[in-house]
């Protein structure tokens, strides 16, 4: 669909005459038919097969054509066509006088033509004016003319429909040879498709305007690159949606359980060494100087009994001080200046020479000790009792009293409250520190799992178009994680389809 | 009165040519055109081909091209229409008749005035 | 080329009575500009020239009886004579002035019965 223009631009009559060669009377009032056709080598009679357009008055005998083209579009005349333009024509311009203001043909006579003009050849679809002047015996008309395409109507032959738009069916305009050019941030063929935040995961992410990045279920961040991880999940992460892959030292469904207790809490004290011994429980093991569960508790340096041979202990701010008896010297009195002529051994304890007779050492008898056998034997010494078990001397024995939770001899067993498997349907058992928990397979609830809740969420094939479907163990629902192209809960809607157009 | 006025018979041998004229009179000639049509024996009508007296455009029947001319001469109001290389075939009467000429057909009225007719006789 | 079919080729009528006679064209000929049919009829007597009888397919020329009219649109035509009179016995013509080559009808002859 296009346009044929044509400006006319003066007519010349100068004798005031017509074709016949008769004057006219008073002047030739001329107004112009025009016929536009198919291309013929002889332009012969025949309907206008584009188009005919006529003019009113324009002026008498010899006159300049004003540019009308703003005040109503009479010059240049218009020559519509609805086709493709075939880039050849015919063009006949008419010059008629108008005796009177009746200028329809049937009111005029065929011998009213002052003169007429045919043109034929090429003419390519362009905005250039092609300028142009004819002249008969006694008339000399100038004009120009072009085709130009319609609104919306592009090519060299004007036959290729396009209009902008930017709308749910296209967002773009028209280029000169009629090809879409999609506004910024769409693409596809008919620039329906957004181009999603710069980005955005090609098949986690999604958009349904540009520079958006919607998340598809399972996916999350700003440029849906990051997994879900399951519903309760402390202290896990995912690879995959809804997945739970507990850190270090963290076990259970939800990563809820702590296998690093040392690590997470640091419970031992004034540089004690953490040992791990199960879910929540842990050994610290006490720097000299320290006791107590978590080597809270700072011993006197003394208490280790550390001086010989009767020697008295002072505690100093750096350490201890032992103060010999006669006869001892040295750090611990543990060196002496007596000999076994001395009778150094108490409490039945036998004398041996050694080193020539310039040193000895006593054998004690049982329940006591010392270099002299000056102490009775405490067994408790050694602190044997593990987790804050007290000790207990009994004659030549001793005893560990342990405290709540934990058995064996030096109370290093920690008491399981899971040992008699209290959790029914294959629940996970948990030791807490005054109890358990019990952690529910899908399908049952209670503090034991003991009650049947309801059956897998994914049983019923839930999702659509090949989606994978997730139990959300901690809500008995379920999740469709939708394949590239599909959105909605069940992954039902197909996502950017370009629609058929009706052209 | 409008009237065609056309030259006389003629009897011409077969490969000869033969020109008839046409003259036109009560009109503005140059503004119509003049189509010339022939009937053989016992036929009907032919279209032979047409001339713009305005300016001389003319348009043939395909089965004459090549062999017909037709020519107008404004000063004298007259219009020719030679045949050559004449054959037996070619025996009829041959009439001009007023035509509408090229441009827009709003005074088309077909062939409303038309000449008694010239019969050219082609025989060995 | 536009190919004009009449028929019949020939009819006898009786005096006073009513002939008709049909014209198609193998393609339209009506020019939807001036909503004009661009076809005409023709009389030929015998020894003369076809005489005009109407163009426009309907518009009769200025002289003509209006006993004779013409009738259609776009490809399908028809002259009557309405009540035939002796003087009417001749060869009808139905042609077509859309375009060039102008093309004829077969013609239709016209008797009294």
């Known amino acids: 669909s296009g346009v044929f223009q044509l400006q006319l631009q003066e007519f010349i009559n100068e004798r005031g005459v017509l074709a016949s060669g008769r004057p006219c009377e008073p002047g030739c009032r001329t107004f112009f038919r025009v016929c536009l056709k198919h291309f013929q080598a002889v332009v012969s009679p025949g309907p206008c097969t584009f188009g005919t357009v006529s003019t009113p008055v324009l002026g008498t005998n010899s006159f300049a054509v004003r540019d009308d083209s703003s005040g109503g579009g009479r010059n240049p005349l218009q020559l519509p066509f609805n086709f493709t333009w075939p880039g050849t024509f015919s063009l006949i311009i008419e010059a008629w006088h108008a005796p009177g203001d009746d200028l329809r043909p049937e009111a005029l006579p065929p011998d009213a033509l002052i003169s007429k003009i045919a043109i034929q050849g090429s003419l390519a679809v362009g905005q250039n004016w092609l300028l142009d002047e004819q002249t008969s015996t006694l008339t000399r008309l100038r004009y120009s003319y072009r085709v130009i395409c319609s609104d919306n109507y592009y090519g060299d032959n004007c036959s290729r429909l396009c209009k902008k738009r930017n709308d749910h069916f296209g967002h773009y305009v028209c280029q000169p040879d009629g090809n879409l050019s999609c506004l910024p941030g769409w693409t596809g063929e008919y620039c329906q498709q957004p181009i999603c935040l710069s980005g955005c995961h090609e098949q986690n992410g999604y958009c349904s305007k540009p520079a958006e990045c919607l998340c598809r279920p399972g996916w999350q961040g700003r440029l849906c690159n990051e997994c879900i991880p399951h519903n309760g999940c402390r202290h896990g992460t995912c690879s995959t949606p809804w997945q739970c892959t507990c850190d270090e030292g963290w076990g259970g469904l939800f990563c809820d359980q702590d296998l690093n207790y040392c690590t997470h809490h640091s419970p031992c004290k004034n540089g004690a060494t953490c040992s791990n011994s199960g879910q929540r429980s842990y050994t610290c093991t006490c720097r000299p100087g320290y006791t107590g569960v978590d080597c809270e508790l700072e011993l006197s340096e003394c208490d280790s009994n550390p001086c010989r041979n009767g020697g008295s202990c002072k505690d100093q701010e750096d350490g201890y001080h032992c103060l010999c008896p006669p006869g001892y010297y040295g750090l611990h009195c543990e060196h002496s200046t007596l000999s076994c002529a001395d009778s150094p051994c108490f409490n039945g304890g036998s004398c041996r020479e050694r080193n020539q007779g310039a040193n000895y050492a006593c054998e004690c008898p049982p329940n006591f000790t010392g270099s002299n056998c000056e102490k009775k034997v405490d067994r408790c010494t050694s602190n044997p009792c593990a987790n804050g078990g007290q000790c207990l001397n009994r004659g030549p024995s001793r005893m560990c009293r342990c405290r709540p939770g934990f058995t064996g001899t030096y109370c290093e067993l920690h008491v399981s409250d899971c040992a008699r498997n209290p959790c029914a349907h294959g629940g996970t058992c948990h030791d807490l520190e005054n109890g358990l928990m019990c952690t529910c397979p899908a399908g049952f609830s209670g503090r034991r799992c003991e009650v049947r809740t309801s059956i897998d969420a994914c049983a019923s094939s839930p999702c659509f178009n090949r989606a994978t479907c997730y139990t959300d163990l901690s809500t008995d629902t379920f999740v469709c994680n939708c394949p590239y192209g599909f959105v909605g809960s069940r992954c039902e809607f197909p996502v950017g389809l370009p629609p058929s157009f009706p052209w | 009165e409008v009237q065609l006025v056309q030259s006389g018979a003629e009897v011409k041998k077969p490969g000869a040519s033969v020109k008839v004229s046409c003259k036109a009179s009560?009109?503005?000639?140059?503004?119509?055109?003049i189509s010339w049509v022939r009937q053989a024996p016992g036929q009907g009508l032919e279209w032979m081909g047409w001339?713009?007296?305005?300016?001389?455009?003319?348009n043939y029947a395909q089965k004459l091209q090549g062999r017909v001319t037709m020519t107008t001469e404004t000063s004298t109001t007259t219009a020719y229409m030679e045949l050559r290389s004449l054959r037996s075939d070619d025996t009829a009467v041959y009439y001009c008749?007023?035509?509408?000429?090229?441009?827009?057909?709003?005074?088309?009225?077909?062939?409303?005035?038309w000449g008694q007719g010239t019969t050219v006789t082609v025989s060995s | 080329d536009i190919v004009m079919t009449q028929s019949p080729d020939s009819l006898a009528v009786s005096l006073g009575e009513r002939a008709t006679i049909n014209c198609k064209s193998s393609?339209?000929?009506?020019?939807?500009?001036?909503?004009?049919?661009?076809l005409a009829w023709y009389q030929q007597k015998p020894g003369q020239p076809p005489k005009l009888l109407i163009y426009?397919?309907?518009t009769r020329k200025s002289g003509v009886p209006d006993r004779f009219s013409g009738s259609g649109s776009g490809t399908d035509f028809t002259l009557t004579i309405s009540s035939l009179q002796a003087e009417d016995v001749a060869v009808y013509y139905c042609?077509?002035?859309?375009?060039?080559?102008?093309?004829f009808g077969q013609g239709t002859k016209v008797d009294i019965k």
């Open positions: 009560g009109y503005t000639f140059n503004i119509y055109g």
């Open positions: 001339i713009s007296a305005y300016n001389g455009n003319t």
């Open positions: 426009w397919a309907f």
């Open positions: 008749a007023r035509d509408s000429d090229w441009g827009t057909p709003y005074h088309y009225y077909g062939m409303d005035v």
């Open positions: 393609q339209n000929i009506l020019y939807t500009s001036n909503n004009k049919n661009y």
């Open positions: 042609q077509q002035y859309y375009n060039t080559p102008r093309t």
